[in-house]
């Protein structure tokens, strides 16, 4: 009759398939992102509460604070599963963590691939987002700062051109618009003037009423969509690095959780085996 498998004699009853290194590496790895997620939620909530009353009118879909809260909450729940699952050696929580992380990774991968394959549709979506942001420019301070930063960074104005600012009710260029900003563009569209120490926030006033040639003496006339697309094309390696930077922690998390799940399963098998054969004279 063949001998039954048994635990290595050296470690006796204390032997475990669960590696403390894997277990605590996964725990601290999740703990780090758990803390980050809480900070994200806290910053998001703070930003949302600190906004003016009229921010309630803002389009939530483009609100960076809401985006921060949503991502933070999802990250919190995910890393919570990872933390508790690794600490308590809970297969159910670890499998949930692993599956969710895999799903997130695959979604990101799919978005990236689809973005390249359907670049025209991706461009259309970017246009839609930018135009929506233009419409809500004055409704949300965070969004306003983001647009101003983008226009200054990429030396551009509007989506396709500076005249896109007419989509905003304050900057609308119809002759009966009562707004003092009628036909204007934000100061972030203005060309830098080295001689001016203080930014002239009125420099974009009435600029939509001028043609490209005249407006280009004062403001950026090129839209931000083309500038953004050109920037993406010329920074593909950088974007690839960022994508890799996001993918590596996810892949590490998936790998560690799967290793730990397999180790826990082996440990359970060992415990069941030991329970079944305690009375075995061969043991």
């Amino acid at each position: 009759m063949a001998r039954r498998p048994r635990a290595p004699a050296a470690s006796g009853e204390e032997f475990s398939f669960v590696s403390p290194l894997v277990k605590y590496l996964l725990f601290f790895f999740n703990m780090l992102f758990w803390v980050i997620s809480m900070v994200m939620v806290a910053v998001g909530v703070y930003a949302r509460l600190m906004k003016h009353a009229e921010a309630a009118l803002a389009c939530l879909a483009v609100d960076p604070a809401i985006l921060l809260i949503v991502v933070g909450v999802l990250m919190f729940l995910l890393t919570f599963c990872g933390c508790i699952g690794s600490l308590r050696e809970n297969i159910c929580l670890l499998q949930t963590f692993s599956l969710c992380l895999t799903a997130v990774f695959l979604l990101q991968l799919a978005a990236g691939i689809l973005g390249f394959v359907f670049s025209d549709k991706a461009r259309g979506k970017v246009s839609e987002i930018i135009n929506n942001a233009i419409v809500h420019y004055r409704d949300d301070l965070d969004l306003q700062n983001l647009i101003d930063f983008g226009q200054k960074k990429f030396s551009c104005c509007g989506g396709i051109s500076y005249k896109d600012w007419s989509q905003n009710m304050y900057f609308n260029c119809s002759e009966d618009n009562p707004s003092r900003e009628r036909c204007s563009v934000p100061y972030s569209c203005c060309l830098p003037t080295p001689d001016q120490a203080v930014i002239n926030t009125m420099c974009g006033q009435g600029m939509q009423a001028f043609d490209y040639l005249e407006a280009s003496k004062v403001i950026y006339t090129n839209g931000c969509i083309d500038k953004l697309v050109n920037w993406i094309h010329s920074n593909l390696f950088l974007l690839g690095g960022v994508a890799l930077g996001l993918a590596i922690p996810q892949l590490v998390g998936i790998l560690l959780s799967q290793i730990l799940v397999n180790q826990i399963k082996d440990q359970i098998k060992l415990q069941l085996y030991n329970q079944q054969h305690r009375a075995d004279p061969w043991y």
Epitope: C173, P178, R180, R182, C183, Q205, G206, Q208, D211
Partner: antibody, heavy 120, light 107 residues
Framework: EVKLVESGGGLVQPGGSLSLSCAAS????????MTWVRQPPGKALEWLVF??????????EYSASVKGRFTISRDNSQSILYLQMNALRAEDSATYYC???????????WGQGTTLTVSS | EIQMIQTTSSLTASLGDRVTISCRAS??????LNWYQQKPDGTIKLLIY???RLHSGVPSRFSGSGSGTDYSLTISNLEQEDIATYFC?????????FGGGTKLEIK
């Protein structure tokens, strides 16, 4: 350099008709609203009509004093603005100016003016 | 329609003087106020738009101020070439309307 040159003024009998022209240069004509403003001798300026730009479908807006009698039009291929005046009255006697009108509500460039006299 | 009133129809000043021309609107025009200069030969030029912004090529001695219904044009150091009639105009609503004008003469 933006330049506007009016022509076509003269002496007309009451009830008569006349067409004024304004040749524009130095800017993208289709991108701008164009307008006519008049000034009777020794009096203030009076806005008459404007025609919107390409983006706004070249639609028109008239003052109550000339609506139904005057017609504004533009030849975008030649950058010329027109004002067709019918059923002229003695009170229409004035210097007629063509100007570039901005949606911000100002007339940033003006022509030198052309004089219309309505008299029998 | 909005009425534009220039109470002073003519003004006499000496060269080098600081001259202020005023204009009043019949309702709030939210700073959509422009100033024009008409020379004796009939030529018209935009001087100031949106209350205080100098049009390109206009000397810095010209300045504008005001809000609501009351606005003014100031010439800080009157020169011979400034002898003209000055008109204010509101661009807040259609129809755009002009003031009666202020004729500036030399003493």
């Amino acid at each position: 350099e933006v330049k506007l040159v009016e022509s076509g003024g003269g002496l007309v009998q009451p009830g008569g008709s006349l067409s004024l022209s304004c040749a524009a240069s130095g800017f993208t004509f289709t991108d701008y609203y164009m307008t006519w403003v008049r000034q009777p001798p020794g009096k203030a300026l009076e806005w008459l009509v404007f025609i919107r730009n390409k983006a706004n479908g070249y639609t028109t807006e008239y003052s109550a004093s000339v609506k139904g009698r005057f017609t504004i039009s533009r030849d975008n291929s030649q950058s010329i603005l027109y004002l067709q005046m019918n059923a002229l009255r003695a009170e229409d006697s004035a210097t007629y100016y063509c100007a570039r009108y901005l949606q911000t509500g100002n007339f940033d460039y003006w022509g030198q003016g052309t004089t219309l006299t309505v008299s029998s | 329609e909005i009425q534009m009133i220039q109470t002073t129809s003519s003004l006499t000043a000496s060269l080098g003087d600081r001259v202020t021309i005023s204009c009043r609107a019949s309702q709030d025009i939210s700073n959509f106020l422009n100033w024009y200069q008409q020379k004796p030969d009939g030529t018209i030029k935009l001087l100031i738009y949106f209350t205080s912004r100098l049009h390109s090529g206009v000397p810095s001695r010209f300045s504008g101020s005001g809000s609501g219904t009351d606005y003014s044009l100031t010439i800080s150091n009157l020169e011979q070439e400034d002898i003209a009639t000055y008109f204010c105009q509101q661009g807040y609503t259609v129809p755009p309307t002009f003031g009666g004008g202020t004729k500036l003469e030399i003493k």
